[in-house]
């Protein structure tokens, strides 16, 4: 796995427990690119940051997974963290 996966994991590990919960809830309704499916709710809500990173990369691949993660962070008001994530993936 590469740089984008590490950047996603780094971002998710920096969320508080409350923020990680909110991230998952927003992920359930975030607008997706055509052709991509949603991670099932049941599986999602019990995941920790590491499991969630793996699931995001498996479902959306690294590049889109990082973009989607950044957008959910922006939806949460965490624009700075989103920018850091995207900067790390484009290095």
């Amino acid at each position: 796995m590469g740089r984008a996966r590490d950047a996603i994991l780094d971002a998710l590990e920096n969320l508080t427990a409350e923020e990680l919960k909110k991230f998952k809830l927003k992920l359930l309704s975030v607008p997706l690119r055509e052709g991509y499916g949603r991670i099932p709710r049941g599986a999602l809500l019990s995941m920790d940051a590491l499991d969630l990173t793996d699931k995001l990369v498996a479902a959306y691949l690294e590049t889109y997974g990082a973009e989607l993660t950044a957008n959910v962070l922006r939806d949460m008001g965490l624009q700075e963290m989103a920018g850091q994530l995207q900067a790390a993936t484009h290095q």
């Epitope: 927003k26 309704s29 957008n71 922006r74 939806d75 949460m76 624009q79 700075e80």
Partner: antibody, heavy 114, light 107 residues
Framework: QVQLQQPGTELVKPGASVKLSCRAS?????????????LEWIGNINLSNGRTNYN??FRAMATLTVDKSSSTAYTQLSSLTSEDSAVYYC?????????????WGQGTSVTVSS | NIVMTQYPKSMSLSIGERVTLRCKAS??????VSWYQQKPEQSPKLLIY???NRYTGVPDRFTGSGSATDFILTITSVQAEDLADYHC?????????FGAGTKLELK
């Protein structure tokens, strides 16, 4: 419809400070509008965890705080000059995606004059 | 900081006209653009978010479009109550920034 409660007017002397309040929830933004001008974002604060973000332009003069017990956000504006005479709005971001400001207070008109 | 440029600064129009307001971002902001309507002596009101999503209760004559750097607010048939200032704003990066506004006036 959520109503964000803000006091109507404040008259302060140059060099003094003023503390503006807003009954709100979630992310609360503070926005400045001088007469006949556009909107300027001062910063925001998350009422649940106290996380703040500032526009560097206002970092030296604005301090954002929250009182969780009363769900009230505050901005203290210090060392005021005539350039700070403006309407100050608080606004909430409650829409789940794209972080728009969907609820706005009626604004507090601050006049800086001796 | 991301600069949001709105044009035209003002427009004089007749009731029933179709109006196109434009907003240009100085860098890519994805779909993180909102449009706000502000009437004299009132606070701004959200019309469109995510570039194209109409906010609750907003009449369907208001339509938002665009992505990346170029955004449009269209009012298909302007009504008297639409005469106001319109601000675009981006929420892609901090600091959040707004355009200088476009004023719609009666001809």
């Amino acid at each position: 419809q959520v109503q964000l409660q803000q006091p109507g007017t404040e008259l302060v002397k140059p060099g003094a400070s003023v503390k503006l309040s807003c009954r709100a929830s979630g992310w609360t933004h503070w926005v400045k509008q001088r007469p006949g001008q556009g909107l300027e974002w001062i910063g925001n604060i998350n009422l649940s965890n106290g996380r703040t973000n500032y526009n560097e332009k206002f970092r030296a003069m604005a301090t954002l705080t929250v009182d969780k017990s009363s769900s009230t956000a505050y901005t203290q504006l210090s060392s005021l000059t005539s350039e700070d005479s403006a309407v100050y709005y608080c606004a909430n971001s409650m829409v789940p995606h794209f972080f728009p400001m969907d609820y706005w207070g009626q604004g507090t008109s601050v006049t800086v004059s001796s | 900081n991301i600069v949001m440029t709105q044009y035209p600064k003002s427009m004089s129009l007749s009731i029933g006209e179709r109006v196109t307001l434009r907003c240009k971002a100085s860098e890519n902001v994805g779909s993180y653009v909102s449009w706000y309507q502000q009437k004299p002596e009132q606070s701004p009101k959200l019309l469109i978010y995510g570039a194209s999503n109409r906010y609750t209760g907003v009449p369907d004559r208001f339509t938002g479009s665009g992505s990346a750097t170029d955004f449009i607010l269209t009012i298909t048939s302007v009504q008297a109550e639409d005469l106001a200032d319109y601000h675009c704003g981006q929420s892609y990066n901090y600091p959040l920034t707004f355009g200088a506004g476009t004023k719609l006036e009666l001809k």
